[in-house]
């Protein structure tokens, strides 16, 4: 029997979760309101693009200073300077030694749709979340996780795969989005920025968070990922934003403390099993949900995205460790490993709580603009 995560069930380290309602509290303009100067051709040049210019913005090779400060929502300027976009170009990389189109990376050529045509699909991820436009769906019940508290043995593989750090999860981690919507966790990985530059994939009203965790799941209706790719609901990802807080997050420290061992691209190490649920926010009842895609090639669609309303707090030092330890291809730092936000193209993001009603204190009479489709339809 699955038990929903309780509010008072605080994660390791005195609570890794952030504010209860951090999303949608600031009335910042969306990135689509920003000027679009110096926009090179690339995957993000699609009709209805909602993102900033995708300048070729590879991470710097030289070491960074220790004085990294994560941006807070209230510290953000209302409009990004046109010449200084936060996005790296949303392209792939053609390996110099050959013409292998599957050798993609963040920044460079060729565009991702040339690597995988699905990357030019109409229902891609990540997206910008606008709480006031989300459809409140009371049918979206608290997420249920079972078996996420892993014993130290067997150990888990932690790998620098050149575009993220990935923890491969063992069998037995079960997650339910609702009745009859059951999944098994496969792996988790992170996306981050660089010094003073946030790197979450999803944004909220144009605001980009310091980092983001993705826990990838396979529907129990499928035995293997290759069978589920591109099938509606075949894969599901739980996503949470990581923010700077005053204390060290001990759950994350179990992974971050091992990053130096896998600094080199392709390297891996074994880490003791840990409480995977402690890496997520404690409130499993408040979240946004929509259907999108994988955020890296092959960009297969049909992925159910669940983005927590509550954030997870890491110390400034931990966020610095995340963004400043790993190396990627071509002797460059593994940084800014996020895809540009993609157009919704008519999709409606659903919310398990009335996000549009109570999350914007500036609106005199807030109105829920979109209605909910029955969960599971």
């Amino acid at each position: 029997q699955r038990l929903p995560r309780m509010q008072e069930d605080s994660p390791l380290g005195g609570g890794s979760s952030g504010e209860d309602d951090p999303l949608g509290e600031e009335d910042l303009p969306s990135e689509e309101d920003s000027p679009r100067e110096e926009d090179p051709p690339g995957e993000e040049d699609l009709p209805g693009e909602e993102d900033l210019p995708g300048e070729e913005d590879l991470p710097e090779v030289k070491p960074k200073s220790e004085e990294e400060g994560s941006l807070k929502l209230e510290d953000l300027p209302t409009v990004e300077a046109p010449g200084d976009p936060q996005e790296p170009q949303n392209n792939a990389h053609r390996d110099k030694e050959g013409d292998d189109q599957s050798h993609w990376r963040y920044g460079g050529d060729p565009p991702w749709p040339r690597v995988s045509p699905a990357c030019a699909g109409r229902f891609q991820s990540p997206v910008d979340i606008r709480p006031q436009l989300a459809a409140f769906c009371p049918a979206l019940r608290p997420l249920e996780l079972l078996g996420f508290q892993l014993p130290p043995l067997p150990e888990l593989r932690l790998r620098n795969n050149g575009h993220s750090v990935q923890l491969t999860l063992p069998p037995g981690l079960e997650m339910a989005l609702g009745p009859g919507r059951e999944y098994r966790a496969l792996q988790l990985h992170l996306h981050w920025g660089a010094a003073g530059r946030p790197g979450s994939e999803h944004t909220v009203e144009g605001h980009r968070f310091p980092a983001e965790i993705h826990v990838v799941h396979l529907s129990t209706a499928f035995a293997r990922v290759d069978e589920a790719l591109g099938r509606p609901g075949g894969l599901a990802v739980l996503a949470a934003f990581l923010e700077e807080g005053p204390e060290e997050n001990s759950a994350y420290e179990q992974l971050l403390s091992r990053l130096e061992e896998i600094a080199e691209e392709g390297s891996e190490t074994q880490v003791p099993g840990l409480d995977i649920s402690a890496l997520l926010p404690s409130d499993f009842s408040r979240y946004f949900q929509y259907e999108g895609s994988l955020t890296t090639p092959p960009c297969a669609q049909g992925v159910i995205w669940t983005v927590f309303n509550q954030t997870v707090m890491l110390s400034a030092k931990q966020l610095h460790t995340l963004s400043d330890t790993l190396w990627g291809p071509g002797d460059s730092r593994l940084q800014l490993n996020f895809r540009a936000t993609q157009p919704l193209n008519g999709r409606v993001i659903e919310a398990s709580f009335p996000a549009g009603v109570d999350s914007s204190p500036r609106a005199a009479e807030p109105v829920q603009l979109n209605s909910c489709l029955a969960a599971g339809d």
Partner: nanobody, 117 residues
């Protein structure tokens, strides 16, 4: 359904060479192209150990014990990853397994390499 098939194993003399192949079949969405692919090996009575890995960016990484002797490469047009093994030693004797890591692990059945005179 994706299946990995290793080949190229066999008996080889010390100092000799061998090339292992790992071919993916039944790959409708071609996830093999987007997987980090690794060769692991397991000698009798020992734990499985990482030999070499090639990432989706073409980056390669080798265990210290094979560095300078083994080379991993991939040909995505053939859905195949190779492990070129030179200057083989008796301690390289093991069953060699191919692993493709794309959201989940895919494993081959293994191919035996025996280095002996």
């Amino acid at each position: 359904e994706v299946q990995l098939l290793e080949s190229g194993g066999g008996l080889v003399q010390p100092g000799g060479s061998r090339r292992l192949s790992c071919a993916a079949s039944g790959n409708s969405v071609n996830i093999f192209s987007f997987a980090a692919v690794a060769w692991y090996r397991q000698a009798p009575g020992k734990q499985r150990e990482l030999v070499a890995v090639i990432t989706t960016t073409g980056g390669t990484k080798y265990s210290d014990s094979v560095k300078g002797r083994f080379t991993i490469s991939r040909d995505s047009s053939k859905n195949t990853v190779y492990l070129q093994m030179n200057s083989l030693r008796a301690e390289d004797t093991a069953v060699y397994y191919c692993n493709a890591d794309y959201l989940q692990d895919y494993w081959g059945q293994g191919t035996q390499v025996t280095v002996s005179s």
